[in-house]
Amino acid sequence: HNTTVFQGVAGQSLQVSCPYDSMKHWGRRKAWCRQLGEKGPCQRVVSTHNLWLLSFLRRWNGSTAITDDTLGGTLTITLRNLQPHDAGLYQCQSLHGSEADTLRKVLVEVLADPLDHRDAGDLWFPGESESFEDAHVEHSISRSLLEGEIPFPPTS
């Protein structure tokens, strides 16, 4: 899977969209999870309604909401009051029994609020010189990772 970058401004809301084949994933609940490390597990953040027919109803877990347009084939995740610690790699998933298919890999970047003059040193997003593979561009504010960029900040 390519990784799509979605950029949001700290303190504001960010909407992430994950398109999918509505027929292929018919009847399947969806989930939004956070990747723990480059090769680690994907930790569930929020999932759609337990009854697939009610997937259009927005479900919240803390400041993260999920809703699914099952006919149109678009899963939408909203991250409200975006914070620096929200930056990182996520996945949109289609659930089937105990299995999960990845619909899209998403890198969330948190940008400093231009109206906020506090120190933005703790805001992280990958620099142009960092490396990661498989990228294509999509805006919302979003883009895809440039070739050679990495989705996780370097660890010392």
Epitope: D21, M23, K24, W26, G27, R28, R29, L51, W52, L53, H96, G97, S98, E99
Partner: antibody, heavy 121, light 107 residues
Framework: EVQLVQSGAEVKKPGESLKISCKGS????????IGWVRQMPGKGLEWMGI????????TYSPSFQGQVTISADKSISTAYLQWSSLKASDTAMYYC??????????????WGQGTMVTVSS | EIVMTQSPATLSVSPGERATLSCRAS??????LAWYQQKPGQAPRLLIY???TRATGIPARFSGSGSGTEFTLTISSLQSEDFAVYYC?????????FGGGTKVEIK
């Protein structure tokens, strides 16, 4: 009429290759999963694997992984089951079936007539 | 892999009587269970899906119940055309698996 029509019976020798087909009609072939089921003589049904012709996403049962290949050609609404080297134990009736999309899960609502494969030296 | 166990292996019933077939899953499959009927020389036919919903064209004498790990197919009054082999199948988790089948024969 919604139907799946399978290719005819085959008699093969051990070690030979084989590709049997399942052609769908009367519905949007690319929008439904297609499964393959084996039934050995006098035995029950065994789920082999499933494919989504829209993008050829395929899942195999561990029992059949590496033993067979499931594929599809959406341009001619046909799914395939193939062997590169047949064994006598592959002798069975093979069914393709369309997966009915449910609120959660998929049951096989339309079945092909079956293809009898006989492998004997 | 989820193991599906059907009982009894053979059920002898007189026409007009009630037949009760059981299917047990080795772990919960929620309500994702289907029942099929197969007659000699024919392909299987879907009877019940979602544990209790009758497929199109299936007579009302066929009913399914259960959820989780225990399921039942009931044929309220057996007709001559109902004597066949019945299979349950879970479609909750890959690989989807079938039970070994129950043969319903004339007593």
């Amino acid at each position: 009429e919604v139907q799946l029509v399978q290719s005819g019976a085959e008699v093969k020798k051990p070690g030979e290759s084989l590709k049997i087909s399942c052609k769908g009609s009367g519905y949007s072939f690319t929008s439904y999963w297609i499964g393959w089921v084996r039934q050995m003589p006098g035995k029950g049904l065994e789920w082999m694997g499933i494919i989504y012709p829209g993008d050829s996403d395929t899942t195999y049962s561990p029992s059949f992984q590496g033993q067979v290949t499931i594929s599809a050609d959406k341009s001619i609404s046909t799914a395939y089951l193939q062997w590169s080297s047949l064994k006598a134990s592959d002798t069975a009736m093979y069914y393709c079936a369309r997966a009915k999309m449910l609120d959660d899960g998929y049951a096989f609502d339309i079945w092909g007539q079956g293809t009898m494969v006989t492998v004997s030296s | 892999e989820i193991v599906m166990t059907q009982s009894p292996a053979t059920l002898s019933v007189s026409p007009g009587e009630r037949a009760t077939l059981s299917c047990r899953a080795s772990q919960s499959v929620s309500s994702n269970l289907a029942w099929y009927q197969q007659k000699p020389g024919q392909a299987p036919r879907l009877l019940i899906y979602g544990a209790s919903t009758r497929a199109t064209g299936i007579p009302a004498r066929f009913s399914g119940s259960g959820s989780g790990t225990e399921f039942t197919l009931t044929i309220s009054s057996l007709q001559s055309e109902d004597f066949a082999v019945y299979y349950c199948q879970q479609d909750d988790n890959y690989p989807y698996t079938f039970g070994g089948g129950t043969k319903v024969e004339i007593k």
